[in-house]
């Protein structure tokens, strides 16, 4: 009888079993296992942009493509050849034996061989297909890889020269700040000469002074013509005595009725009976290092120290930390009192801060904090706020909890990106947070749009640049 | 049509002062931001002051402040650029210049310039 | 301060050939930026504004474009007229001139 078989090896391949008589031929056709069945979904053109396939993935899939095809090859070979030697040899039987029902079955093989081979032809065809997909994507995958290389290059030679441009701008920076350093010292050598030549002024003065007391008391014993010089010179004394007074006075308005009284702040210097706004010289207790500060003496009822002030730009803010800790700027107009100052005064009692801000439309708001101190350098002179009232909006522009402070060569805020760089001034930013009062100074007309400009984004938005603000402080119990 | 005529110039010699004045006429001054503009010979421009509508701002170069005042007068129709301390470096044509509407610093219309020249 | 560095400082061109001018901010000034044309004797003449905008009256073959830090004005077919010095200027913060370039006739 006659049997046709068809089942799978070991190895993945097709075999084909025929029972012809006594004989049995068995044959072992490759399947495509490496290549996708023509119905998987694949598209050919897809590129992917950003970050093509690896290049040596791509041809090692290639070659198998190519060995599978090659495999195929042979194999049609051999079974062609096959075929014909087989079908000789059966015709020869088949003419001897002259048996129809032999013939029914060889031509039945023949034709499950013919489709078999059709098949094998369509699946080749499908492969050469996908190969040449697979190739033209290779090729738009490296054309991509080359576009995205030439790319980069630009990108490094760019970022090279801004960063020659960056070290330019340092060096030239470097050379000022040397230059100011220098220009520092002389200024504080012709201080020092006048203060020594005041001095040896002032005692000039006290011994002229002792002289005429002497000539006073010798003057008594005398007549009245003696007594009447007494009241001249006595005269001329007091005369000396007030110059003397309003002189000093006149230099530092700390000094009164001719004698030195150290103030911590401005509400001391306003309790003292100092009740004008100016400048003023502050002294921490238990210490001598003074700081010049302006003294609000009339808003809210005076007494405010000024520890911020924007409201023409005629001072750069961008400044480093040592610049911020010690302070800068001129007390008069636009400045920065000095971190440590702030931070030393606000850890020895409860102050309030008030911000006192004004648009470029006319308008002026301000915040209040009930309780305000920065925490030591240590801690980077992180802010400590509570109980917000005030017209410049609800929530706090300062974010809460507070912040470390962080300047441009100093980067404490929360963001990857360098805040203090991108947004300028020395700040106690998040990331980058709602506010910066030391931003760039925009001129009324530029003030919008601007990411980089004096903002407080709960009373004017984001892109507002202010015209004026006023950092102060004061005594909660005052 | 939009005109404007700058006078004052002249020889000056250097810590000496002038005033500067620019004439405008076909348009309104009082709805417009004024400016001077300069430009020392054979050199490039420089902005050096500018003036709100009705003057209650101003604007001057770092290099002028304190020695050079913008102002204005929009009932005579006038800008005045008022220069003290005058330096060697301030020797340039001053030209007044219109401001484009709700623009900064955008200059759509300028005079002829007027020379002042710092020497002793 | 905001430095307007502009590029190159003559250009040789011959009429009826296009002239590209170029001028470069020292920081992004996004698309403030300003060109004048001066010719000798004479008030710088205002042509193009916010990077791209025509002033009145200005003819088409002159055109601006960029954004940031990067600017470029573009004179597609140069008339006699057009020989001059040509300014840019920056007014995003404060206000700021380029050194200007120079078109020549070649």
């Known amino acids: 009888y006659n049997n046709f078989r068809k089942s799978m090896d070991s190895i993945g391949k097709k075999q084909y079993q025929v029972q012809h008589g006594s004989c049995s031929y068995t044959f072992l056709l490759p399947e495509m296992d490496n290549c996708r069945s023509s119905s998987s979904p694949y598209v050919s053109n897809a590129v992917q942009r950003d970050a093509p396939l690896e290049y040596d993935d791509s041809v090692q899939r290639l070659q198998v493509l190519e060995n599978i095809m090659e495999n195929n090859t042979q194999w049609l070979m051999k079974l062609e050849n096959y075929i014909q030697d087989n079908m000789k040899k059966e015709m020869v039987e088949i003419q001897q034996n002259a048996v129809q029902n032999q013939t029914a079955v060889m031509i039945e093989i023949g034709t499950n061989l013919l489709n078999q081979t059709a098949e094998q032809t369509r699946k080749l065809t499908d492969v050469e297909a996908q190969v040449l997909n697979q190739t033209t994507r290779l090729e738009l995958q490296l054309l991509e890889h080359s576009l995205s290389t030439n790319k980069l290059e630009k990108q490094i030679l760019d970022q090279t020269s801004e960063i020659n441009k960056l070290q330019d701008k340092n060096s030239f920076l470097e050379k000022k700040v040397l230059a100011m350093e220098d220009k520092h010292i002389i200024q504080l050598q012709s201080i020092k000469e006048e203060k020594d030549q005041l001095q040896v002024l002032v005692s000039k003065q006290n011994s002229i002074i002792e002289e005429l007391e002497k000539k006073i008391v010798t003057a008594t014993v005398n007549n009245s013509v003696l007594q009447k010089q007494q009241h001249d010179l006595m005269e001329t004394v007091n005369n000396l005595l007030t110059m003397m007074s309003t002189s000093n006075s006149a230099k530092d308005p700390t000094v009164a009725k001719g004698e030195q009284i150290s103030f911590r702040d401005c509400a001391e210097v306003f309790k003292s009976g100092h009740t004008t706004n100016g400048v003023y010289t502050l002294t921490l207790p238990n210490s001598t290092e003074e700081v010049k500060a302006y003294c609000d003496m009339e808003a809210g009822g005076g007494g405010w120290t000024i520890i911020q002030r924007r409201e023409d730009g005629s001072v750069d803010f961008q400044r480093t930390w040592k610049e911020y800790k010690v302070g800068f700027g001129n007390p008069s107009g636009e400045y920065w009192l000095g971190n440590e100052f702030v931070s030393q005064l606000t850890n020895q009692q409860r102050y309030v801060l008030k911000i006192h801000l004004k648009d470029w439309e006319g308008n002026e708001a301000y915040s209040l904090y009930e309780h305000f101190y920065l925490s030591s350098e240590e801690l980077n002179y992180r802010i400590h706020l509570k109980g917000l009232t005030g017209t410049a909006g609800k929530i706090s522009s300062i974010s809460q909890p507070g912040n470390d402070f962080s300047t441009k060569d100093a980067d404490n805020d929360k963001c990857i990106c360098k805040c203090s760089q991108m947004l300028t001034g020395g700040w106690w930013f998040d990331a980058c947070g709602p506010s910066n009062l030391n931003g760039m100074y925009y001129p009324q007309r530029q003030n919008t749009n601007k990411f980089n400009g004096i903002k407080w984004y709960y009373w004017k938005g984001s892109g507002y640049s202010l015209k004026g603000t006023t950092m102060m402080i004061r005594p909660a119990g005052f | 049509e939009v005109q404007m005529v700058e006078s004052g110039g002249g020889l000056v010699q250097p810590g000496g002062s002038l005033r500067l004045s620019c004439a405008a006429s076909?348009?309104?001054?009082?709805?417009?931001?004024m400016s001077w503009v300069r430009q020392a010979p054979g050199k490039g421009l420089e902005w050096v002051a500018n003036?709100?509508?009705?003057?209650?701002?101003?604007y001057h170069v770092d290099s002028v402040k304190g020695r050079f005042t913008i102002s204005r007068d929009n009932a005579e129709n006038s800008l005045f650029l008022q220069m003290s301390s005058l330096r060697a470096e301030d020797t340039a044509v001053y030209y007044c210049?219109?401001?484009?509407?709700?623009?900064?610093?955008?200059?759509?219309?300028w005079g002829q310039g007027t020379l002042v020249t710092v020497s002793s | 301060e905001i430095v307007m560095t502009q590029s190159p400082a003559t250009l040789s061109v011959s009429p009826g050939e296009r002239a590209i001018l170029s001028c470069r901010a020292s920081q992004s000034i996004s698309s403030n930026l300003a060109w004048y044309q001066q010719k000798p004797g004479q008030a710088p003449r205002l042509l193009i504004y916010?990077?791209?905008t025509r002033a009145t009256g200005i003819p088409a073959r002159f055109s601006g474009s960029g954004s940031g830090t990067e600017f470029t004005l573009t004179i597609s077919s140069l008339q006699s007229e057009d020989f001059a010095v040509y300014y840019c200027q920056q007014y995003n913060y404060w206000w700021t001139f380029g050194q200007g370039t120079k078109v020549e006739i070649k």
């Open positions: 076909g348009f309104t001054l009082r709805s417009y931001w």
């Open positions: 210049a219109r401001d484009m509407e709700a623009s900064a610093g955008l200059f759509d219309y």
């Open positions: 916010g990077a791209s």
């Open positions: 003036i709100k509508e009705d003057g209650s701002e101003k």
